[in-house]
């Protein structure tokens, strides 16, 4: 029979993607770098179905995703179009709130305790989720 590609150990398969869920917290940039070293990226949510899957695995815990507006417009880390894509913001969000007293606004998106999205200060140490395409998961990494 044909060989079936599998996700790496400790990664969870769903709809032709592999996901890894952290148990500790990092700032968004450090979480982003962690996923890049895995030859993966912070999770990019493209459907309600994927939203429910991720939400089920992370529980009611603030968790970074691969969405930010650090350079102006909101962008997904894998280039998925933000404007036409799936969104699940909390009411009144994103608000780029400056009242937190940490300097600057809020440029990184995370899942909140109910799964809906909020923008927050990128330096906060939240959990994170890495994602990679299943076909890519079994391939050798690119030469860097």
């Amino acid at each position: 029979g044909s060989e079936r590609t599998c996700c790496p150990v400790n990664w969870v398969e769903h709809e032709r993607s592999c996901y890894w869920f952290s148990r500790s917290g990092k700032a968004w940039a450090d979480a982003d770098n962690y996923c890049r070293l895995e030859d993966a990226h912070l999770v990019v949510v493209t459907s309600w179905e994927e939203q429910k899957f991720v939400q089920h695995h992370i529980g009611p815990v603030n968790t970074w995703m691969g969405l930010h507006d650090q350079n102006g417009p909101w962008k997904w880390v894998d280039g998925t179009d933000y404007e036409t894509g799936f969104k699940n913001w909390r009411p009144e969000q994103p608000d780029d709130w400056y009242g937190h007293g940490l300097g600057g606004g809020e440029d990184c998106a995370h899942f909140t305790d109910d799964g809906r999205w909020n923008d927050d200060v990128c330096q906060r140490p939240y959990r994170w989720v890495c994602e990679t395409e299943l076909d890519k998961a079994s391939q050798e990494p690119p030469l860097l």
């Epitope: 790496p8 150990v9 400790n10 990664w11 890894w20 952290s22 148990r23 500790s24 990092k26 700032a27 940039a29 450090d30 770098n33 962690y34 070293l37 895995e38 030859d39 993966a40 330096q123 140490p125 890495c130 998961a137 990494p141 860097l144």
Partner: antibody
Framework: EVQLLDSGGGLGQPGGSLRLSCAAS????????MNWVRQAPGKGLEWVST????????YYADSVKGRFTISRDNSKNTLYLQMNSLRAEDTAVYYC????????????????WGQGTLVTVSS | EIVLTQFPDSQSVTPKEKVTITCRAS??????LHWYQQKPEQSPKVLIK???QSFSGVPSRFSGSGSGTDFTLTINSLEAEDAATYYC?????????FGQGTKVEIK
Amino acid sequence: EVQLLDSGGGLGQPGGSLRLSCAASGFTFDSYAMNWVRQAPGKGLEWVSTISGTGRRTYYADSVKGRFTISRDNSKNTLYLQMNSLRAEDTAVYYCAKEEDYYDSSGPGFDPWGQGTLVTVSS
Amino acid sequence: EIVLTQFPDSQSVTPKEKVTITCRASQNIGSSLHWYQQKPEQSPKVLIKYASQSFSGVPSRFSGSGSGTDFTLTINSLEAEDAATYYCHQSSSFPRTFGQGTKVEIK
């Protein structure tokens, strides 16, 4: 207290094998990539290999590619370096080192490098 | 491969003097440049990470600056215990590389 404890060094024969270990404690091991760095006697530091946090991806210096294998057991909080086809030029102190985060705020006394383990390759 | 070149190779300095060590990268590495101190028979210690981030517990006389290709480690008011070899290291891309080291001796 955060610690990295290197072990497994010793005398290896040219063409032979050794396996180094690095036992980690005091931090969430699978949340960090890990590295091996070596230092030949009287020389500078040389990066050897890096493994991603989950172990999914590995990276090697050209000088050890195809001979050395980095791996990790996250259930045991341990990093490994399997050294095969040893050469005289592999003689060095080998250090394991934790990947540094930009925003990490480790407490005082934290040392992201092991104490080193000496590998001597000689017949 | 990104080559890191340190200046000077060695330096003999009087206590309380200011020491400046530079590290030049052969291509842009952003802020992914780290500084280590190594004393004889000891493992390297992190001084500065990501060009300018002071590492926990490191004396305030050590500071780092720069981005892109040019970086500087500064030791304000050198102390006798600072006699060591200092290395820069880039984590921007693989293969990761180190500078050749700068040996600081006390006069």
